[in-house]
């Protein structure tokens, strides 16, 4: 036999106390699927949260964060304070990035500057608290007689002659 509750559409609940009739979810509650025996209470976006999408009888409200904060966690379960570029959020608040590190966003942690020498390159533009270094051509490419504009020709495999 088919469960009578399976006929209850989203936006209703199957009321066991009323011979399994389909009752509408009360205001500020929802059921996103059919055949539900309860309605879920709508999320309320309060305080630092603000409403991105209103609750309806078939879907929950969605929250985001008020300016100066950003979402963390699934479904924006938390709001975390923004910092300025060049800073990171610590337990004591926003702190400037240490020398040798940078953060180009209002969230997240300070990351070390790229080590250009690991790629055999030179530093073209120094890093700051807000920006990573810009690596330039390798020092060999900048030796006298070498063009700093024309990139070196790609290496050819043995046995291939230029066209």
């Amino acid at each position: 036999l088919q469960d009578p509750c399976s006929n209850c559409p989203a936006g209703t609940f199957c009321d066991n106390n009323r011979n399994q009739i389909c009752s509408p979810c009360p205001p500020n509650s929802f059921s996103s699927a059919g055949g539900q025996r309860t309605c879920d209470i709508c999320r309320q976006c309060k305080g630092v949260f603000r409403t991105r999408k209103e609750c309806s009888s078939t879907s929950n409200a969605e929250c985001d964060c008020t300016p100066g904060f950003h979402c963390l966690g699934a479904g924006c379960s938390m709001c975390e304070q923004d910092c300025k570029q060049g800073q990171e959020l610590t337990k004591k608040g926003c702190k400037d990035c240490c020398f040798g590190t940078f953060n180009d966003q209002k969230r997240g942690i300070c990351r070390p500057w790229t080590n250009c020498s690991l790629d055999g390159k030179s530093v073209l533009v120094n890093g700051t608290k807000e920006r990573d270094v810009v690596c330039g051509p390798s020092p060999a490419d900048l030796s006298p007689g070498a063009s700093s504009v024309t990139p070196p020709a790609p290496a050819r495999e043995p046995g291939h002659s230029p066209q």
Epitope: S29, D40, Q44
Partner: nanobody, 120 residues
């Protein structure tokens, strides 16, 4: 920590009335459905009703004798019980949940209960 405190229970004669209160501390009722349950001596927990957002849902036994209401300013939900009978004797509990009605769900928080005795 959420705490629910029931009050208003006591001894009442058959046919009499009582109003039970459920007050929350540590959290407002704003985003919760509030339910009432009862447990008679030697019996299992029985669903009385749920209040949420101006709507009340009731168990199938009480036959319009019970009414659930709420006072937002006092963060309190009430259970008004009229025409009381001996079989209404029980410990009455309030509870909160993120679901409506609470007839088929386990509460998120439940109080300690208040005893109602209906006897002549």
């Amino acid at each position: 920590e959420v705490q629910l405190l029931e009050s208003g229970g006591g001894l009442v004669q058959p046919g009499g009335s009582l109003r039970l209160s459920c007050a929350a501390s540590g959290r407002t009722f704003d985003n919760y459905a509030v339910g009432w349950f009862r447990q008679a001596p030697g019996k299992e927990l029985q669903y009385v009703g749920t209040y949420w957002s101006g709507y009340a849902h009731y168990g199938d036994f009480e036959n319009n004798r019970f009414t659930i209401s709420r006072d937002n300013s006092k963060n309190t939900v009430y259970l008004q019980m009229n025409s009381l009978r001996a079989e209404d004797t029980a410990v009455y509990y309030c509870a909160i949940s993120l679901k409506y009605p609470m007839a088929t769900v386990t509460p998120d928080y439940q109080g300690q209960g208040t005893l109602v005795t209906v006897s002549s």
